[in-house]
Every structure is written in C-alpha cells, then in structure tokens.
Interface confidence: medium
C-alpha cells in the first residue's frame, strides 16, 4: 500500500512530487538551539554529536536509515546510520543512498523514471492492503493511506513539507516528523550554528513565514552568545 511504501527511502529518493526533500527537511525547518542528544549515560551537545535514536527509517535523514548499530545487536536499540553507497550490501531500499535502491541485496543506481513508475504501480496494486512487498522485501504499514489525498493537519506524521497543509511545514518533533505551523512574526526561530546542523535536531521549528526572516532580537544584542534569542521579524 501507499502506507507500506511511505516508510521507505525509495520514496525519499525520488524526484517530486513523490520524492522531494524528505528525511530532514533542511531549510524547511529552524532547529531549536542548545539541544542535547543521548550518548551513553550522559547527554551530548550538538558539537559532540551522538547518533540519533530511531524506530523507523522515516525518522532518519535522507542520507540515513534506521538500524541496530551492531550486527545481531539489541533490536531495541536502533540509531540512524549513514546510507550505503552503490554496490554495497543492503536489505531494503531505505539502506541505500539517494539515487540508489536495493536490488538482490546490493545497492544499485536507479533509473529514476522507471523506478518511480515501479513504485506507483506497487502503490496502485496493493492500495488498501495491510502489507505489500517492494522489490521482494515485506514492508510494515506506516502512514495513513489518506496521506496523499488529504494534506496533513497540525501534528500529523509527515515525510516532507509538501505532505502538510498550507501554513505548515514538516519538522522533527522528537517521536517523529510532524506537520508544524510556519512561524509568525515575533515567534522564536533558530539560526543554525553550523552548516547541516538542522539534520541533528530532536525538536525542529518551521521557517519564518512570508516576509519574515530569523534575526536576533533587538534587546538581546548584549546577551551572551549562547543565549541570544532569534525571532521572526519583518524584512
């Protein structure tokens, strides 16, 4: 079903409208500052990044998949791992990097048009069923089969911002990626500290709405560097 396929990087790796910017929404979100991550028995800051815990592939970035870090490891402990490049071994599409898919246990380059058609066919054939297979691998039902008929409302699970209704963007919210409101004037936003850091956030904020930009709050200029507050302000 569409449900079954939505949990796959196969969808993430396709051109729009089925593909597009999935995984971490990139510029679509504004990440909360000073967020901490679990690492062993202590919490780590963004500059000492620890792997992101996950339960399903769609909770990871475009270039990641969700799995146990060690072969035969504790099934309850899964983290987002870097995707596998071409000719590397795989067990499902989500393990392969964008532009590739899993065929006969190996990540191979996808002919985008052919592959997209294959997925659309799979969706059509098995629409409404609880389980379906894609390239021979059984996939668990995940998102609602209505996902692509009705745009996601605030709080509903999403893969990318185009899944969400107008005025919402797709951003990580700890347990999943959900549709959140685009930020209004005066609301707290976040400038990323370094390139790519948006991909590490547990709680992400949307971008500022039209005509607004994320800038340091006037009365916070004197504050210490770490506690500077950014808000959405008129250009």
């Amino acid at each position: 079903t569409l449900n079954s396929v939505l949990n796959s990087n196969a969808i993430k790796n396709l051109p729009p409208p089925l593909g597009g910017a999935a995984g971490h929404p990139g510029s679509a979100v504004s990440a909360a500052p000073g967020i901490l991550y679990p690492g062993g028995n202590k919490y780590q800051t963004i500059d000492n990044y620890q792997p992101y815990p996950c339960a399903e592939d769609e909770e990871c970035g475009t270039d990641e998949y969700c799995a146990s870090p060690t072969r035969g490891g504790d099934a309850g402990v899964q983290i987002c791992l870097a995707c596998r490049k071409r000719r590397k071994r795989c067990m499902r599409h989500a393990m392969c990097c964008p532009g590739n898919y899993c065929k006969n246990g190996i990540c191979v380059s996808s002919d985008q048009n052919h592959f997209r058609g294959e997925i659309e066919e799979t969706i059509t054939e098995s629409f409404g069923n609880d389980h379906s297979t894609l390239d021979g691998y059984s996939r668990r039902t995940t998102l609602s089969s209505k996902m692509y008929h009705t745009k996601g409302q605030e709080g509903s699970v999403c893969l990318r911002s185009s899944d969400c209704a107008s005025g919402l963007c797709c951003a990580r919210h700890f347990w999943s990626k959900i549709c959140k409101p685009v930020l209004k004037e005066g609301q707290v936003c976040t400038k990323h500290r370094r390139k790519g850091s948006h991909g590490l956030e547990i709680f992400q904020r949307c971008y500022c709405g039209e005509g607004l930009s994320c800038r340091i709050q006037k009365d916070h200029h004197q504050a210490s560097n770490s506690s500077r507050l950014h808000t959405c302000q008129r250009h």
Epitope: N3, N7, L36, A55, E56, S176, I202
Partner: antibody, heavy 116, light 111 residues
C-alpha cells in the same frame, strides 16, 4: 472536531486485569502517535505509555513496564491499554491523548479503581 | 529521573498578571529548550495551552504566554479572569525511552 472517548474503566481487585479502549474520531488516527496519561485522585499527571502511528514503536513509564501493554487498531480508530497485575497505586483516571504537537487533544478519562 | 518543579499554588486578583515557574535540569527543560503547559479545571481533562515554550495553539487566548530562561520555564497569564482558576502543569520530554515528564502542578486561585 477531534474527539477521544475512553471506556473500560471500573473496579478491579489487586492482581487483576483490565483493558481500556479509546475511540478516536475527527482526525486521521493512523497519522498520529497516541498515548495514555493517568491522574491519581487529588494528584498530578503521570505519563503512562506512548505508541507510534503504525504501532511498531511503544514506550512505557518505568512504573508500568512489564505490566501494561499499549496497542492500537488503525482500522477501528481505537487505542488500547491492557493492564495486568494491577496494584492499588494504579488507581487513577486514565486519559487517552493524541501526540500531535505534544499532547494536543485529550479524552475525558475513565476511572480505574484497584481495591479489595 | 527527570523532575520538573512547580510551586504548589499561586494567586492573583482579576486583571492582574501572574507567573508560574517550572524548573528542570539540563537534560529536559534546559537542554531541550522545549516545554509545554496544560490547564486543567476540576473534573475536566487537561488542555494544551502552550507548546514549544512560547507558542499558543489556535483557540488559546493571547493572555497566556510562555518563556524560558536557563533551566526555568515560565507561564504568564495577564489580565487574570475568574475562568483562569485551574491547575496548571508544565511538561517536557525525556530522551530515551521517550517519556513525557510533568511538573507537580500549580493551583491558580483567582481572588
């Protein structure tokens, strides 16, 4: 509009079992994580358990781990909480809550009383 | 275990402003920069009033505002009204396993 209706509460003896249900309507149930939160009489809120939209991922508070099981039936738009080996301290109003942007919608709750 | 600490009670007169604090640790309130606030009237279900520390869900009065400084989050209610009398809970999230953590609650009395 969003509606969550809990049922299945009642009086049960220590060591007994009970199964709570939460019927959801007004939203696409299978697109949301869901959870159970309880409140003992005159006390504060305590998160009990959460479940992913697909049901493949579950989380529990330490106080109920191994005794309670959260599950869902997306075809019936229903959330469940199977409670076994009940103790007096499990006496509370049990709320079903949608995990949208945090716990954004709550049911009215169902009272579970564990007493001999 | 994570704990969020709130004052047991606060009070104010109609029209006044009151602030309820919620103090946590670097692994919850301070670290996540993420706190929610819920209002609960006697015998009723809790209602989400503030999420993401300072954002109001639609339908919530703009008299309610949230902020955070260090490991302390605050809920401010301005222009206090009789119907604001209720219990207020702050809430944050623990990381692993996913667990919602609530403060002990604050009873607001409108004098």
């Amino acid at each position: 509009q969003v509606q969550l209706v809990e049922s299945g509460g009642g009086l049960v003896q220590p060591g007994g079992s009970l199964r709570l249900s939460c019927a959801a309507s007004g939203f696409t149930f299978s697109s949301y994580w869901m959870s159970w939160v309880r409140q003992a009489p005159g006390k504060g809120l305590e998160w009990v358990s959460g479940i992913s939209y697909s049901g493949s991922n579950t989380h529990y508070a330490d106080s109920v781990k191994g005794r309670f099981t959260i599950s869902r039936d997306n075809s019936k738009n229903t959330l469940y909480l199977q409670m076994n080996s009940l103790r007096a301290e499990d006496t509370a109003v049990y709320y079903c809550a949608r995990m949208g942007i945090d716990l954004d919608y709550w049911g009215q709750g169902t009272l579970v009383t564990v007493s001999s | 275990d994570i704990a969020l600490t709130q004052p047991a009670s606060v009070s104010g007169s109609p029209g006044q402003s009151i602030t309820i604090s919620c103090t946590g640790t670097s692994s919850d309130v301070g670290g996540f920069n993420y706190v929610s606030w819920y209002q609960q009237h006697p015998g009723k279900a809790p209602k989400l009033m503030i999420h993401d520390g300072s954002n109001r869900p639609s339908g919530v009065s703009n008299r309610f505002s949230g902020s955070k400084s260090g490991n302390t989050a605050s809920l401010t209610i301005s222009g206090l009204q009789a119907e604001d009398e209720a219990d207020y809970y702050c809430q944050s999230w623990d990381v692993s396993p996913i667990t919602a953590v609530f403060g002990g609650g604050t009873k607001l009395t409108v004098l």
